[in-house]
């Protein structure tokens, strides 16, 4: 293959790969017809002048996961055909000016996971054809004005995981073709009005895991093509009324892990494509009427781990397509009988870890397709007659960890549960709390005659005594639609940002946590 260095492997497809700790300099001679060169996991500490001079046909060059800390300005001379250059995962602190000069075909430049302290306009001024620039995982504290002014064709810019404390409103102004901008995991406290105004083709904006406290009202008003907006894990305490008004293409919005105290009606301006809204881990205390009424296509609404104590009867108006509603781990004591009436397509509802002491008899009246109801860890003493009668698809009902009062009033519920045991799961059953003489005994098998009779015995029909069996032959908990462990956050669809964390039973969507925010 026109000579392959002993430390490398060379394939017929003009691909050369050089790996191993024994390599301390760029191997020579490299085959002149190489089109792809990878130098990975070596002990190379510096690149001297023109080590690639004889391989001018090179299209892709990956120099990753080395000890590289110094590069001579002329290191990449004669690589005019190079389209892809990665220097990721090295130890670069400084980029020499003119390093990328002559790389007229360069489209992707990856400088991520180094120790870069600064970038200057002169660094990229020659890279007019660049489409992708990855700078995440460095030590950048600021971006000077003009740094990206020559990169008019750039479509993807990643500045995540740096130490940026502020952004100049002019720094992105010439990036009219930019589609993806990532600024996650920095130290941004606010973003000046106008910062994103020039980004008319932006589709994804990742601002999660900063320290942003306030959003300017018109911050996103020029970003009509925005599809994904990540604002989770910041310090946002309020949302200006018009902040999301001009985002008709938005299909993902994350706001979990902020300090939101309230949501005003119509705050989520027309977003016909939004399917999921993640609002867990905020400080929301109440939900007013029509707060989500513009989200006609919403299918998943996560409001868990807030401080919600009041939900207005019309709070969920407009959510006719909603499939999953998570309200667990809040401070709900009461629910209006009509609060879920509009949710005709609801399948899963989690209400566990609240303070519910009773439920209205009509609470699930119009929600005929419910498949999973989580009511564990509340303060329920009984449930109204026939509350689950019409829920023919119900296959998961969690009622444990409530202070069930096992007097004669509990008989209708006991009888229904007896005939519908598969729905309760096998791991944890509801037990009586009072009277004291039956405390701790299973509600399903309790002999109510032992318990203290209540003052009145209702003379109304009992729960239906039709046994229920699931359609499937087996009934493992793990296949249920909404298990008691829930998906904590959306898995965001870019791999350089996603981190997987497993949490305990305080998780949010009541499966494992794939949290990338």
């Amino acid at each position: 293959y026109h000579g392959c260095p002993s430390e490398c492997t060379c394939s017929r497809a003009s691909q050369v790969e050089c790996t191993g700790a024994r390599i301390v300099a760029v191997p020579t001679p490299l085959p002149w017809n190489a089109m792809s060169l990878q130098i990975l996991n070596t002990h190379i500490t510096e690149l001297n002048e023109s080590p690639f001079l004889n391989i001018s046909a090179l299209i892709a060059l990956r120099i990753e996961k080395n000890e590289l800390s110094r590069i001579t300005p002329g290191a990449f001379r004669n690589l005019g055909s190079l389209r892809y250059l990665s220097l990721a995962n090295n130890k670069l602190q400084v980029l020499p000016i003119g390093l990328f000069q002559g790389l007229d075909s360069l489209e992707s430049l990856l400088l991520s996971s180094n120790q870069l302290l600064q970038i200057q306009p002169a660094h990229f001024s020659q890279c007019s054809n660049l489409k992708e620039l990855q700078l995440h995982g460095n030590h950048l504290e600021y971006i000077p004005d003009g740094a990206f002014d020559h990169l008019v064709g750039l479509t993807k810019l990643n500045l995540g995981k740096n130490s940026l404390t502020h952004i100049s409103p002019r720094v992105f102004q010439h990036l009219g073709n930019l589609q993806v901008l990532r600024l996650y995991e920095n130290r941004l406290t606010d973003i000046p009005m106008g910062t994103f105004d020039g980004l008319v083709n932006l589709q994804e904006l990742a601002l999660q895991q900063n320290q942003i406290g306030l959003l300017s009202p018109g911050l996103f008003h020029n970003n009509h093509n925005l599809q994904r907006l990540y604002l989770s894990n910041n310090h946002i305490s309020q949302l200006p009324p018009s902040v999301f008004m001009q985002l008709p293409q938005l299909n993902r919005l994350t706001l979990f892990g902020n300090s939101l105290k309230e949501l005003s009606p119509g705050i989520f301006g027309p977003m016909p494509n939004l399917r999921e809204l993640w609002l867990y881990d905020n400080h929301i205390s109440s939900l007013p009427d029509n707060v989500f009424s513009n989200l006609r296509q919403l299918q998943v609404l996560i409001l868990s781990r807030n401080q919600i104590s009041f939900i207005s009867p019309g709070a969920f108006n407009g959510l006719t397509e909603l499939r999953e509603l998570s309200l667990h781990t809040n401070a709900l004591q009461d629910l209006d009988g009509n609060v879920f009436r509009m949710l005709a397509n609801l399948q899963n509802i989690s209400l566990q870890n609240n303070r519910l002491r009773q439920l209205p008899g009509n609470i699930f009246a119009n929600v005929n397709g419910l498949m999973a109801i989580q009511l564990q860890n509340n303060q329920l003493e009984n449930l109204p007659l026939g509350i689950f009668d019409h829920l023919g698809k119900l296959c998961e009902l969690r009622l444990y960890d409530n202070p069930w009062r096992c007097d004669s009033d509990i008989l209708p519920l006991r009888n229904w549960l007896l005939l519908n045991q598969p729905r309760l799961g096998t791991d944890t059953v509801p037990v009586c709390f009072s009277p004291a003489n039956v405390r701790g005994q299973s509600l399903i098998i309790i002999n109510v005659n032992v318990a203290v009779p209540s003052v009145h015995v209702p003379e109304v029909p009992s729960y239906p005594e039709t046994p229920w069996y699931p359609d499937t032959p087996s009934y493992p908990d793990t296949t249920s639609v909404s298990s008691t462990t829930e998906l904590t956050s959306p898995v965001e669809d870019y791999t350089d940002l996603t981190t997987i964390q497993v949490t305990d039973d305080r998780s949010v969507w009541g499966m494992t946590q794939a949290q990338s925010g």
Epitope: Q333, D334, N377, V429, V431, S434, R439, D505
Partner: antibody, heavy 120, light 112 residues
């Protein structure tokens, strides 16, 4: 006879963690919830959290990020794990349950407590 | 979180006299549907673990002497010891369980 016995206290370095145990007898953890409460010397009572019969947990919101309550029903033991300890966590730690009271969050049986000192 | 404020911090009363302890919550402890106030009183004698005296603002726990009584509504509650006995020397705590429990700061009762 109903009994709750705390153990695992002692001297802990700041920034360290502790794991306290509460061994119960006379009742089953599959039937009763167990609370953890602490009291600094000469100070008031502070509710830390509870694990219910079915395994659900509730926590004091101010301490939630540092606390985990768990249990092993077969061993009749409840555990309190607390991380990132500081001097202010020095206290007597009690476990308690609701044996007879009609108050769901009432605590009518208490252990004698175990002392935790956080100091370098 | 609901904040519970007790007054006074300490109280010296003669044997046989009435002792009154006040507890104020930062929000109402009444659940309108159950019509219960979720407030309890605990007694802690020196060197001992706490003991539950009263729950639901006014329901005495079994075995508690009838000289102990609880009253109040909304946000204001009172524990009364109608005739103080020597064995009543203790610190008394109120506790709300309307939301997740919080205790008051305690009131120390001594003999004058």
């Amino acid at each position: 006879e109903v009994q709750l016995v705390e153990s695992g206290g002692g001297l802990v370095q700041p920034g360290g963690s502790l794991r306290l145990s509460c061994a119960v007898s006379g009742f089953s953890l599959t039937s009763y919830g167990v609370h953890w409460v602490r009291q600094a010397t000469g100070k008031g009572l502070e509710w830390l959290g509870v694990i219910w019969a079915g395994g659900s947990t509730n926590y004091n919101s101010a301490l939630m990020s540092r606390l985990t309550i768990s249990k092993e029903n077969a061993k009749s033991s409840v555990y309190l794990q607390m991380n990132s300890l500081r001097a202010g966590d020095t206290a007597m730690y009690y476990c308690a349950t609701h044996m007879i009271t009609e108050d769901y969050y009432g605590m009518d049986y208490w252990g004698q407590g175990t002392t935790v000192t956080v100091s370098s | 979180d609901i904040v519970m404020t007790q007054s006074p911090d300490s109280l010296a009363v003669s044997l046989g006299e009435r002792a009154t302890i006040n507890c104020k919550s930062s929000q109402s402890l009444l659940n309108s549907r159950t019509r219960k106030h979720y407030l309890a009183w605990y007694q802690q004698k020196p060197g001992q673990s706490p003991k539950l005296l009263i729950y639901w603002a006014s329901t005495r726990e079994s075995g508690v002497p009838d000289r102990f009584s609880g009253s109040g509504s909304g946000t204001d509650f009172t524990l009364t010891i109608s005739s103080l006995q020597a064995e009543d020397v203790a610190v008394y705590y109120c506790k709300q369980s309307y939301n997740l429990p919080t205790f008051g700061g305690g009131t120390k009762v001594e003999i004058k």
